[in-house]
């Protein structure tokens, strides 16, 4: 069972008084509609809150919005609606906050039917002041900032025009018409697709992919017969219609679209889809949907070029295009990902990989936990994690799994212990080692958040009744204290803390309801007095990530290196602080065959680490062989796994073979066999 508050465990002395002195209530003087909250900048303490209230009238919708600003992490708010001339703000566009610490904010206003264009309010001083700007177009999408220069904005109009501003929305220029999708790339490059014959939908599969590197002065067409495109890490992907049928295939570029290579992935039909699950500068996880309405597909992992793919996981749950998948990057430990598979019996099971998709396993059963009714064997079962799919199915799961890069090893998630995900009320589980081992942390569903880089975990019970109690732990969820933050319970709507988990403030949002009115209210609690002192060297202990067997010489080696971290000792009640930087020490491992993937035309027989030549090329492998670039077809059978840093040890050197000779097929004409694509 989860540790209770009554156990003789890490009590923080006088915490009630300390927290009471640091609890700040703010009642918002408006009717309850919707509320959205945005943090402006990093470590600035600036929060913008937009409340909107809709009254649907017979002919039109009357709306009212209010804008509030805090500069002390939510302890106090000031009504700044007058700065935006009491204009109604369109919530579907949200608040467009600039990258990094630019202090830029764009709000998109609702305008009356007959107007020539939309209206935005712009701030470049962390929302202290706003400038109203009337647009020469009606925006279809939220303004998109260039990641490299926050003065550069792009937006699509309702007329499918691509508009760019070079002076943070002051002046706008339409750089192209008939645009379906536009994205910023690196170095202020814009990629976009265009249609020729009427509409994006009608031309799907016949779109052109364009690039501009000078904000619209010049253009280059970098792809035709495009269905869609995506960016991930240093890779540009496009799904391209095949010449001969209605299937499409993925092509990849690592030079901004100048040259393309066919990816060695299965082609998909009209009802299927590709999805980039995760990507970094080393590699990409790609989901390829199965034919038919199965709700699952296959995960493939790429090589360092994004060209050769290894099958990573079968029966991967992914409902429909843009639908639900539980695929989660565990950001608190390198190489770890969690997702769900759909079993043959249609039950859903959780799988985890610790080596970037090389191997997937079930999650280890938490210590001292019983297997539930889904388990055939009451002693052998696994932990199954609730994520996006469970939330979409309206199960009693208020939050997806949580991990933070600066709270090393910590993963918090709702789950059940059995043979598959259960529809019963879940509990909250925690791992302190990146998912290798788990412990029940809290009984029943909760909202949770990480503060002070893992120094504090805060949780609130998920309940339909009003609440007035918050729980917190200073030892990675082993022991919990409860604090009553208000006499009068509120209907809870959300927990908010500054992104990045460095803050020591938490805001509890909700509303009060009386006979006639209901009002938004927030309580901001600062935990600084709970963690009275700054952490010192003696408060940290050394931890080896990915350790499974200390007797193994290469214990902890993942992708060719191991990492030791300084982690806060569980009993230390102190502040990591806002400037906390994770201290880690990497050490390179010797290479083994596990550090290499099989190159195109090779495979690993079961329970063998050697790559063996495929006797014949079939299906999408044959297509890749026929149409792929020649230099990708000469190989010694091995390629280092992307991001692998091993040195020495095994070096699988053998003769280089030209697989082009194997590209023969009776089904294709000789001229097609000789052709090759760029």
């Amino acid at each position: 069972s989860a540790p209770g508050e009554d156990e003789e465990c890490g009590r923080v002395r006088d915490f009630v008084a300390k927290l009471a002195n640091n609890t700040h209530q703010h009642v918002f003087d408006d009717l309850r509609g919707s509320v959205s909250l945005s943090w402006v900048g990093d470590s600035t303490g600036v929060i913008l809150v937009l409340t909107t209230f809709h009254v649907p009238l017979v002919i039109m919708t009357f709306g009212q919005s209010k804008l509030y600003r805090s500069e002390d992490y939510g302890k106090n708010f000031k009504d700044i609606t007058d700065l935006i001339n009491n204009t109604f703000i369109r919530t579907e566009f949200g608040m467009a906050i600039g990258p990094e610490n630019s202090g830029k904010v764009v709000l998109t206003a609702e305008v009356s039917g007959g107007s020539r264009g939309g209206r935005i309010f712009r701030s470049s001083d962390f929302a202290k002041n706003f400038v109203q700007t009337d647009l020469p177009f009606h925006p279809l999408t939220q303004m998109m900032y260039s990641p490299q220069n926050s003065d550069y904005l792009l937006a699509l109009s309702t007329e499918n025009g691509l508009w760019v501003s070079k002076n943070f929305g002051g002046k706008w220029e339409e750089i192209h018409k008939a645009v379906c999708l536009a994205k910023w790339g690196s170095d202020n490059t814009i990629f976009f697709t265009t249609y020729a014959n009427g509409s994006c939908k009608a031309d799907l599969g016949a779109l052109e992919l364009w690039r501009t590197s000078d904000l619209g002065k010049s253009f280059k067409t970098i792809g035709v017969k495009i269905y869609s495109f995506g960016l991930g890490g240093r890779f540009l992907f496009a799904s391209v219609m095949a010449d001969k049928d209605t299937t499409r295939r993925i092509h990849v570029s690592t030079d901004q679209g100048d040259t393309w290579s066919m990816a060695q992935l299965p082609s998909v039909g009209q009802e299927q889809f590709y999805s980039i699950l995760a990507a970094n500068d080393d590699m990409v996880f790609m989901h390829v949907d199965e034919p038919g309405d199965t709700g699952f597909g296959t995960i493939f992992t790429s090589d360092d070029r994004g060209i050769v793919y290894s099958k990573s996981l079968d029966r991967h749950l992914y409902t429909t295009t843009g639908g639900e998948t539980d695929f989660t990057n565990v950001t608190s430990l390198r190489g770890v990902y969690i997702t769900s598979v759909l079993s043959e019996d249609n039950s859903i099971q959780t799988m985890i990989t610790f080596d970037q998709g090389g191997r997937w396993t079930h999650l280890r059963k938490p210590e001292n936990s019983e297997c539930d009714a889904t388990a055939k064997n009451k002693n052998e079962c696994s932990l199954h994690i609730h994520a996006s799919y469970s939330i979409s199915q309206k199960l009693n799961v208020p939050m997806a799994p949580l991990s933070e890069p600066n709270a090393v090893g910590i993963v918090i998630a709702h789950g059940s212990v059995g043979d598959a995900i259960s529809v019963m009320v879940p509990d909250v589980y925690i791992s302190d080692d990146g998912g290798y081992s788990w412990t029940k942390m809290l009984e029943g569903p909760h909202y949770y958040t990480i503060l002070d880089s893992g120094g504090i975990i805060v949780a609130i019970e998920h309940s339909s009744r009003p609440i007035n109690v918050i729980k917190f732990s200073t030892d990675e969820g082993q022991c919990w204290q409860t604090y009553t933050f208000t006499r009068d319970p509120i209907y809870f709507t959300g927990l908010a803390s500054e992104p990045g988990a460095r803050s020591m403030n938490i805001s509890i949002w909700g509303f009060t309801e009386s006979f006639l009115t209901s009002q938004w209210v927030s309580y901001t609690i600062d935990f600084k007095d709970i963690l009275e002192r700054n952490c010192e060297e003696k408060d940290y202990t050394i931890w080896l990530a990915h350790s499974t067997d200390p007797e193994d010489y290469e214990d902890g080696c993942i992708l060719g290196y191991k990492e030791q971290f300084l982690r806060l000792a569980k009993s230390s009640v102190c502040q990591n602080g806002r400037d906390y930087v994770v201290t880690k020490q990497p050490s390179i491992c010797l290479c083994s065959l596990e550090d290499f993937l099989c190159d195109f035309g090779y495979y690993r027989p079961e329970n063998d680490s050697k790559c063996v030549e495929q006797p014949e090329l079939k299906g999408h492998d044959l297509e890749f062989c026929l149409y792929g670039r020649e230099e990708h077809l000469t190989t010694n059978g091995y390629r280092k796994i992307p991001g692998d840093k091993c040195q020495g040890g095994v070096n699988p050197v053998r003769e280089v073979k030209d697989l082009k000779k194997k590209c023969t097929s009776n089904f294709l004409s000789p001229e097609k066999q000789n052709s090759k694509s760029n």
Epitope: C479, T541, P550, G556, S572
Partner: antibody, heavy 124, light 106 residues
């Protein structure tokens, strides 16, 4: 079976330094922390500090900070503890011990293998 | 640093007795506690780690319990070989030992 073999007894003058060695055999030396613990005559156990051979990551008890240096040589599977500015109160048996490990935490599972102890006498 | 207080400091008992030694931490250490046995002129020997896990090769008459700040080592039936000094040790953060409990023949 893992064994830790320590260097022989030492007699030292006040103000000087002593360096005690601890050689491991029969196990994976690099993957475990080695702690140094001392015991003055008729007294209890006192932890001085420890080291992880991979990367040489050492940490010390506050009482000995600045006076003790713990090092490790992976190639010979040997850990060393050097104590400087010796005084008569440093007369004790000095033990090296391997920290047991069930997970990635080096110091959380107790010391499962001990050396035989090295007697250091500080006397003028 | 975390202080560890062991009690009693000396304990007189007979063969076959049930013996209990307690150890209190100055702040919560969760379950990160070990127990050792030491005989004169010998190095300590690990009995229990993580408060209640028995080290391999240690007789099952030894058991540990507790979490947070209060811990107990129990010898269910004292044997002649068990007369020795026992130490607790916290392992969360910098290591500290308790003062020891000498179990002597009554």
């Amino acid at each position: 079976q893992v064994q830790l073999v320590q260097s022989g007894a030492e007699v030292k003058k006040p103000g000087s330094s002593v360096k005690v060695s601890c050689k491991a055999s029969g196990g994976t030396f690099r993957n475990y922390a080695i702690s140094w613990v001392r015991q003055a005559p008729g007294q209890g156990l006192e932890w001085m500090g420890g080291i992880i051979p991979i990367g040489g990551w050492a940490n010390y008890a506050q009482k000995f900070q600045g006076r003790v240096t713990i090092t490790a040589d992976e190639s010979t599977s040997t850990a060393y503890m050097e104590l400087s500015s010796l005084r008569s109160e440093d007369t004790a048996v000095y033990y090296c011990a391997r920290q047991g490990r069930k997970t990635g935490y080096y110091y959380y599972y107790g010391m499962d293998v001990w050396g035989q102890g090295t007697t250091v006498t500080v006397s003028s | 640093d975390i202080q560890m207080t062991q009690s009693p400091s000396t304990l007189s008992a007979s063969v076959g007795d049930r013996v209990t030694i307690t150890c209190r931490a100055s702040q919560s250490i969760s379950s990160w506690l070990a127990w050792y046995q030491q005989k004169p002129g010998k190095a300590p020997k690990l009995l229990i780690y993580k408060a209640s896990s028995l080290e391999s090769g240690v007789p099952s008459r030894f058991s540990g319990s507790g979490s947070g700040t209060e811990f107990t080592l129990t010898i269910s039936s004292l044997q002649p070989d068990d007369f020795a000094t026992y130490y607790c040790q916290q392992a969360d953060g910098h290591i500290t030992f308790g003062g020891g409990t000498k179990v002597e023949i009554k």
